[in-house]
């Protein structure tokens, strides 16, 4: 009679993570008598997956009833497959022996490949805010996918970015892989409403990429522009001076009025108006009693925005002239105003 052969008809089996893998194995003869065992890998370090004779293998079920006398089908099913199950599986026939069974013949092996989808990409931006014209870095990470081949793209408001570097780890063979990418983005004043998107495409996703997003509102700081103007006279001895704080983001802003270098009033921006681009405008006014001053008054609007060094704009109020005349001469008085940093 022809010697028993162990046949594993499938050279390779591809299974999605979470699914059940069927590993097929048949013997060509009932002789010699003895059990079948399944191993992952070959050689002394091989891992026992299933033993027909003894042991507890909760994830493994047999396709046919191995207790039947004439059974020659030793196929198994492994449930809830994970990338860690990838490898080559061998169906091995043992001959009954004493005290131990002896390995008789092995199948050619079936390579189990596991497809696992990438995790949702996580995008993170810089720790500190940056101002327009500066370049900031965003990172994108996704893990746990297999096979290794993957596509990663970056977008800003739907437009593809080209300045990025991507690594897939590990470089060699592994049960699953991770991707890490860093993109450089140049900020503009209009970026408060902008979004950066990292998109990951993988064979398991079947054309529908996963996306991770970051809002540039978390990253950008748009410093305000200041304008100090003198309004027409409110009363005989009073002048109304306004400080227009324009196009700033985020909202956190504190304004201080100084009269000849002395603090007159400090307030925090509350009732701001929002511009279309997401930046804010705010206006503060100061009522100056001209009769209380003998000399010219230097009024300074000092703004501290989002914890940054203060910026200021000054306006010279001439007391010598009649108040009513001053109100009609706003433009001329503003020529001497200057912007400077106060540290």
């Amino acid at each position: 009679e022809e010697e028993l052969q162990v046949i594993q008809p499938d050279k390779s089996v591809l299974v999605a993570a979470g699914e059940t893998a069927t590993l097929r194995c048949t013997a060509t003869s009932l002789i010699p008598v003895g059990p079948i065992q399944w191993f992952r890998g070959a050689g002394p370090g091989r891992e026992l997956i299933y033993n027909q004779k003894e042991g507890h293998f909760p994830r493994v079920t047999t396709v046919s009833d191995l207790t039947k006398r004439n059974n020659m089908d030793f196929s198994i099913r492994i449930g809830n497959i994970t990338p860690a199950d990838a490898g080559t599986y061998y169906c091995v026939k043992f001959r009954k022996g004493s005290p131990d069974d002896v390995e008789f013949k092995s199948g050619a092996g079936t390579e189990l490949s596991v497809r696992a989808k990438p995790s949702a990409p996580v995008v993170s931006g810089p720790a500190a805010r940056a101002t327009p014209q500066h370049t900031v870095s965003f990172t994108c990470e996704s893990h746990g996918f297999s096979p290794r081949d993957i596509t990663l793209k970056w977008f800003k408001n739907g437009n593809e970015l080209s300045d990025f570097q991507t690594n897939v780890d590990p470089v060699g063979e592994s049960v699953s892989y991770s991707i890490h990418s860093t993109a450089k983005v140049v900020l503009t004043r209009e970026d408060v409403h902008s979004q950066v998107i990292c998109e990951v495409a993988h064979v398991t996703l079947q054309g529908d990429p996963l996306r991770g997003t970051a809002n540039l509102s978390e990253t950008i700081r748009v410093p305000p522009t200041l304008e100090v103007t003198q309004q027409p006279v409110r009363a005989e001895n009073q002048v109304n001076v306004t400080c227009q704080v324009r196009k700033f983001y985020p909202q956190r802003l504190q304004l201080t009025w100084l009269e000849n270098g002395n603090v007159s009033r400090t307030e925090t921006a509350s009732t701001v108006t929002e511009n279309k681009d997401g930046t804010y405008n705010w206006m503060s006014w100061l009522l100056v009693n001209v009769s209380a001053h003998r000399d010219d008054v230097k009024l300074t609007c000092q703004v501290e925005h989002d914890g940054q060094p203060a910026v200021s704009k000054s306006h010279d109020l001439k007391v010598s002239a009649h108040p009513k005349e001053q109100g009609s001469n706003t433009a001329a008085e503003n020529t001497g105003s200057n912007e400077r940093n106060i540290y």
Partner: antibody, heavy 123, light 107 residues
Framework: QIQLVQSGPELKKPGETVKISCKAS????????VNWVKQGPGKDLQWMGW????????TYVEDFKGRFAFSLETSASTAYLQINNLKNEDSSTYFC????????????????WGQGTSVTVSS | DIQMTQSPASLSASVGETVTITCRAS??????LTWYKQKQGKSPQLLVY???TLAEGVPSRFSGSGSGTQFSLKINSLQPEDFGSYYC?????????FGGGTKLEIK
């Protein structure tokens, strides 16, 4: 060659359930998604959603959430569309179609279609 | 949801003529647009993808163009087999909505 073969026409009463099959051949079934498209008597096409044959996750368009269910029998390379509690407005032809993607794994369209299954709902 | 508007709804032309069908998206869909052709009583067939790439086996008399919100499908030198309905569909996110279709008839 690649083929998607759908089950035959169905005549049902309102309130009943119908299950349409779509058997794929000529390619590895679990490599490509299966889309479902409805074509009403007015002849307009409506994308109902799709099922990822690898992860088994389904995406449904808002209009098709609830009574509609996509399912798979991967060992038989078959996708199913089940419609519960049938209504008169479900009378249409239903197509299954394979979702194609490029070398970078980006979807670009439906490259192979089933022949369509006509469902008539009438009391 | 993104709306796709096709025009004209119907069109009569003669064999040998050149026709253009347009498709407008309610918002920017970049080049994520596909064109399908459907003959009476048959399944739709993929014609053009990514706005301008011809699908395998599609004759060169067909051409797609456009990006953003405006797209068109041009058929040069119409052949008898070109008559039928044409649909555009976007795939910029979900749901992947179709246009209302354009019925191309023989004059």
């Amino acid at each position: 060659q690649i083929q998607l073969v759908q089950s035959g026409p169905e005549l049902k009463k309102p309130g009943e359930t119908v299950k349409i099959s779509c058997k794929a051949s000529g390619y590895t079934f679990t490599d490509y998604g299966v889309n479902w498209v409805k074509q009403g008597p007015g002849k307009d096409l409506q994308w109902m959603g799709w099922v990822n044959t690898n992860t088994r996750e389904s995406t449904y368009v808002e209009d098709f959430k609830g009574r509609f269910a996509f399912s798979l029998e991967t060992s038989a390379s078959t996708a199913y569309l089940q419609i519960n509690n049938l209504k008169n407005e479900d009378s249409s032809t239903y197509f299954c179609a394979r979702g194609a993607y490029d070398a970078y794994y980006y979807y670009y369209g439906m490259d192979y279609w089933g022949q369509g299954t006509s469902v008539t709902v009438s009391s | 949801d993104i709306q796709m508007t096709q025009s004209p709804a119907s069109l009569s032309a003669s064999v040998g003529e050149t026709v253009t069908i347009t498709c407008r998206a309610s918002e920017n869909i970049y080049s994520y647009l596909t064109w399908y052709k459907q003959k009476q009583g048959k399944s739709p067939q993929l014609l053009v993808y990514n706005a301008k790439t011809l699908a395998e086996g599609v004759p060169s008399r067909f051409s797609g163009s456009g990006s953003g919100t405006q797209f068109s499908l041009k058929i040069n030198s119409l052949q008898p087999e070109d008559f039928g309905s044409y649909y555009c569909q976007h795939h910029y996110g979900s749901p992947r909505t179709f246009g209302g279709g354009t019925k191309l008839e023989i004059k």
